[in-house]
């Protein structure tokens, strides 16, 4: 059992390419940092894996369609939005996100768990920030992205709690 750090989340919702720059921000303390995650702030556009069957990102060939800076092939800072489960470990998911160029990994919990979060153990996948958020929050974000809304998340280090029991997948 180890201590766990919560994550402050500031989430914005924007309909891209409309010329409208009004965004809606939501500030909450609804995430927890992974046990092996850097305890650092990070920000980026949330990007789920490509394809409806790829939400768990357990296939090593999983890709992400990332927005680019206008007029370039340079990816904007982005965070992988991945669902827990699917037969692979948290470390697998986080390492895949890192390999694809993500600045962080946001893992959302299983369906049916509502707002429950757990401390993730992901030894070896320590290069990018990794947090877990609840299923309700993750599903809401995912559905927004699937409707064409661009969702940006700013993650900041919250408070220390503990000790909790670790989970690897």
């Amino acid at each position: 059992a180890e201590a766990v750090w919560t994550a402050y989340l500031n989430v914005s919702w924007r309909v891209p390419h409309t010329g409208v720059n009004r965004t809606v921000w939501e500030l909450s303390e609804e995430g927890v940092y992974g046990q092996d995650s850097p305890l650092e702030p990070v920000a980026g556009v949330l990007v789920p894996p490509d394809g409806p069957g790829a939400l768990n990102a357990c296939n090593p060939h999983t890709n992400f369609t990332v927005p680019t800076v206008w007029g370039s092939t340079v990816q904007v800072s982005w965070l992988a939005l991945i669902q827990r489960g699917g037969g692979c470990t948290f470390a697998d998911k986080i390492h895949l996100a890192y390999e694809r160029g993500a600045s962080g990994a946001v893992i959302f919990n299983f369906p049916g768990t509502r707002n429950e979060v757990i401390p993730m153990s992901h030894p070896g996948a320590v290069d990018i920030v990794a947090i877990m958020i609840g299923n309700l929050k993750g599903t809401k974000i995912l559905q927004s992205i699937q409707r064409g809304i661009q969702v940006t998340m700013v993650i900041e280090v919250g408070k220390k709690h503990g000790p909790w029991v670790n989970h690897y997948s």
């Epitope: 891209p16 720059n21 965004t23 920000a43 927005p67 800076v69 206008w70 904007v76 800072s77 661009q150």
Partner: nanobody, 118 residues
Framework: QVQLQESGGGLVQAGGSLRLSCAAS????????MGWYRQAPGKEREFVAA???????YYADSVKGRFTISRDNAKNTVYLQMNSLKPEDTAVYYC????????????WGQGTQVTVSS
């Protein structure tokens, strides 16, 4: 409406340095991304560098390690420090402010000429 005014261009020898500035006025906030693009004679306008809210920076591969973008939110100004300049850096450099986010079409400045002689 956003107005952008670039300065700092000029003629420099290869290996030299220049610092471009771009002052923005009008409806601009610190949350908007700002960037630099360039257009060489007979070529399309191309991305050079950008800086988002939170000071995250982005660079074209051709300028990485040589150019540095920065911004002063209090002055609504973005800078491009260009070191180790090469003749192929010769172009008109345009300041950009993104309408809402870095992947959105930008507002453009009038441009400033940078000429690098060999």
């Amino acid at each position: 409406q956003v107005q952008l005014q670039e300065s700092g261009g000029g003629l420099v020898q290869a290996g030299g340095s220049l610092r471009l500035s771009c002052a923005a006025s009008g409806s601009i906030s610190g949350g908007k991304g700002m960037g630099w693009y360039r257009q060489a004679p007979g070529k399309e306008r191309e991305f050079v560098a950008a800086i988002g809210s939170g000071a995250i920076t982005y660079y074209a591969d051709s300028v990485k390690g040589r150019f540095t973008i920065s911004r002063d939110n209090a002055k609504n100004t973005v800078y491009l420090q260009m070191n180790s300049l090469k003749p192929e850096d010769t172009a008109v450099y345009y300041c950009a402010v993104y309408t809402t986010a870095l992947d959105e079409y930008p507002y453009w400045g009038q441009g400033t000429q940078v000429t690098v002689s060999s």
